[in-house]
């Protein structure tokens, strides 16, 4: 018993004055607490506690379950203890079969002995199976056997406490170890779609998937910059031990424009937190926005190809698309496709392929698209550049020489006179009259220009050249003059 200096309160004394006592089953346990300020006896085993206010603790017929620590406490709060083993050949172990361990921590298999003199106190696997190679344990006859640094791999491990009693191996009831995982990473969170576009009144539903080692992961949907609790539904699954998945589904049954915003799925565990967001945009009605990928006024040379390309945003999905020219719908030569295969894609492309365009194929080409809410269209004005063509070249009765040419852009007609047999006509002749004939006609196609000169001005044999030209090219027509005396005998036009 401890000795203390006089005047200081001292712990109680216990009789018998031993730290341990072994009693045979059925025999008496008699413990006396000697202290003028005696308060109580307490008995502890396997987290169970009993109290006794008498200074003498008497158990007339000891049972194995009376094995444990007996503590006497005085009024100063000082105490002394004795550990009593009640040896019972039929009950070597006291057991609390609940066995839980936290990963990486130690855990106690509660199987204290009723006989401290047995040997080989240890753990054994059930049905003769070996324990995991890395499982280390420390036995303590009064408490049980501590498994050191519990591993996840030990989950649902079946084991017994074991000891050799009089040369025979004795096993306790079986224990099933349940391992609580340590959270060693933040939860893994993902969302069904990163963005949603809806019309007013439509249902908004988004699912967040949370994956972790335990169902004790916390998760919630939050609206950014709002404290309002959102209504969510859960589904969860254990895909095996330490492989837990939860699906948290947020639903707004009839979305409004002011529901637009960013929604966050937040999850946390004891290691840390993770989140993922989705964006909701609610529009009062659907829309179509068309973006031409080339200028809507197109100039193309005769015989060449051109592609008319538009991109457009359509929500909801486009239902009808068409390309029209001169009130006729193209059945082929065009394609329409989504800009991306993404489920939330609202952008599309339409292409009209015009090949080997003729001068007569200029005009307005219109792309029309519609969905259930709106229609939209865009027009391309296509001008086909053509080399001038001389339509007529005549000597009129009034002595005028007239040249009519067509082309696009509008041709210019110049006149030249070549005296004699010269091939190069360099002397230019000013026209008397120039008119654009179809300026008030259709806005596309060739433009017709008429130019006239007075042939009476020519006094010598020669050739008159009418030259029509524009940005694309040039074409000429010729008039030959031959004089007989004072008369112009003939004029032969040729090209």
């Amino acid at each position: 018993q401890p000795s203390v200096s006089p005047g200081e309160p001292s712990p109680p004394s216990i009789h018998p004055a031993k730290s341990e006592l072994i009693v045979r089953v059925g025999n008496e346990i008699r413990l006396l607490c000697i202290d003028p300020g005696f308060v109580k006896w307490t008995f502890e085993i396997l987290d169970e506690t009993n109290e006794n206010k008498q200074n003498e603790w008497i158990t007339e017929k000891a049972e194995a379950t009376n094995t444990g620590k007996y503590t006497c406490t005085n009024k100063h709060g000082l105490s002394s203890s004795i550990y009593v083993f009640v040896r019972d050949p039929a009950k070597l172990f006291l057991v609390d079969r609940s066995l839980y361990g936290k990963e990486d921590n130690d855990t106690l298999v509660r199987c204290p002995l009723t006989d401290p003199e047995v040997t080989s106190y240890s753990l054994k696997g059930c049905q003769g199976k070996p324990l995991p190679k890395d499982l280390r344990f420390v036995p303590d006859p009064k408490a049980g056997i501590t498994i050191k640094s519990v591993k996840r791999a030990y989950h649902r491990l079946c084991l017994h406490c074991s000891a050799d009693q009089e040369g025979k191996s004795v096993l306790s009831d079986k224990f099933i170890l349940k391992v609580r995982p340590a959270f060693k990473a933040v939860p893994v969170v993902s969302v069904s779609k990163a963005s949603y576009l809806l019309r007013e009144g439509e249902e908004f539903t988004v699912t967040c998937t949370i994956k972790d080692v335990s169902s004790s992961v916390y998760s919630t949907w939050k609206r950014e910059n709002s404290q309002t609790k959102l209504q969510e539904k859960y589904n969860s699954w254990h895909h095996g031990d330490f492989n837990y998945e939860r699906q948290a589904t947020l639903t707004i049954s009839s979305a409004r424009v002011n529901d637009s915003g960013v929604f966050m799925c937040y999850a946390n565990n004891t290691f840390g937190s993770a989140n993922v967001t989705t964006t909701l945009e609610v529009v009062d009605k659907g829309f179509i926005n068309i973006f031409p990928m080339i200028n809507t006024t197109v100039f193309v040379n005769d015989g060449e190809n051109v592609d008319l390309i538009v991109e457009y945003e359509a929500f909801p999905k486009p239902e009808h698309q068409q390309w029209i020219y001169m009130n006729r719908t193209f059945t082929d030569k065009w394609e329409d496709y989504p800009k991306s295969e993404n489920e939330s894609n609202i952008r599309y492309v339409s292409e009209l392929h015009l090949t080997r365009l003729k001068g007569t194929e200029g005009g307005t080409y219109t792309f029309l698209v519609s969905n259930s809410d709106v229609n939209a269209s865009i027009a391309f004005n296509v001008y086909v550049n053509t080399k001038p063509e001389i339509l007529t070249y005549d000597r009129l009765v009034n002595g005028m020489l007239q040249c009519v040419a067509a082309g696009f852009p509008e041709p210019t007609i110049d006149w030249y006179f070549c005296p004699g047999t010269e091939q190069r006509c360099s002397a230019s002749v000013l026209p008397v009259d120039v008119q654009t004939l179809n300026a008030s006609g259709p806005p596309f196609g060739k433009l017709v220009v008429q130019s006239s000169i007075d042939s009476s001005a020519f006094k010598h044999n020669g050739t008159v050249e009418c030259k029509a030209y524009n940005d694309v090219g040039k074409t000429s027509a010729y008039f030959n003059f031959a004089f007989k005396g004072n008369n112009k005998e003939q004029i032969h036009p040729h090209t």
Partner: antibody
Framework: QVQLVQSGAEVKKPGSSVKVSCKAS????????ISWVRQAPGQGLEWMGG????????NYAQKFQGRVTITADESTSTAYMELSSLRSEDTAVYYC????????????WGRGTLVTVSS | DIQMTQSPSSLSASVGDRVTITCRAS??????LNWYQQKPGKAPKLLIY???SLQSGVPSRFSGSGSGTDFTLTISSLQPEDFATYYC????????FGGGTKVEIK
């Protein structure tokens, strides 16, 4: 041996709340999963939710989401289940049981607490 | 939720009979299935966990089998104390119990 000791029977008015306690004697309470399972008269068993005290986050059955709150006090080895907005259909025996989360079986049960909801 | 369908809902048997109760899950639950016995006015008691493991202290006449969606509880030789209601329970998703099978004396 570990026992789960529940609080006594309750009679409640519709619309009110009830809080039932479950004290574990012995064992490593903080690592247990403690669940609440109810049984209406003559009916089957219905899991309401559970908690593992060391983790602190409760899990609830979809049916009771928003109406039940499960908590645990490690210092007293006690778990609590509070059910709000009571209606007559909530009249049942409410059991606390060890297990029910992370694939744990219910290997230990309390004796049950009868909650009667009546106007 | 995963639905658990127990059959039969009740049965009459005599002491010494072999009794079989089946439980079917609406989707695969691997082996996360437990069986309980409940007597009137008492809390349920665990008999079988993980489909086929016998809980400590439960007589060996009780056995469980199955995996995936179909499971069976067998009492090899019915004893007087076995007249009770038996429940299956899955632990893969939100916990659900079967509707129960009442075993009565014939």
């Amino acid at each position: 041996q570990v026992q789960l000791v529940q609080s006594g029977a309750e009679v409640k008015k519709p619309g009110s709340s009830v809080k039932v306690s479950c004290k574990a004697s012995g064992g490593t309470f903080s690592s247990y999963a403690i669940s609440w399972v109810r049984q209406a008269p003559g009916q089957g068993l219905e899991w309401m939710g559970g908690i593992i005290p060391i983790f602190g986050t409760a899990n609830y059955a979809q049916k009771f989401q928003g109406r039940v709150t499960i908590t645990a006090d490690e210092s007293t080895s006690t778990a609590y289940m509070e059910l709000s907005s009571l209606r007559s259909e909530d009249t049942a025996v409410y059991y606390c049981a060890r297990g029910g989360l992370d694939t744990d079986e219910f290997d230990l049960w309390g004796r049950g607490t009868l909650v009667t909801v009546s106007s | 939720d995963i639905q658990m369908t127990q059959s039969p809902s009740s049965l009459s048997a005599s002491v010494g009979d072999r009794v079989t109760i089946t439980c079917r899950a609406s989707q695969s639950i691997n082996s996360y299935l437990n069986w309980y016995q409940q007597k009137p006015g008492k809390a349920p008691k665990l008999l079988i966990y993980a489909a086929s493991s016998l809980q400590s202290g439960v007589p060996s006449r009780f056995s469980g089998s199955g995996s995936g969606t179909d499971f069976t509880l067998t009492i090899s030789s019915l004893q007087p104390e076995d007249f009770a209601t038996y429940y299956c329970q899955q632990g893969v998703s939100d916990i659900t119990f079967g509707g129960g099978t009442k075993v009565e004396i014939k």
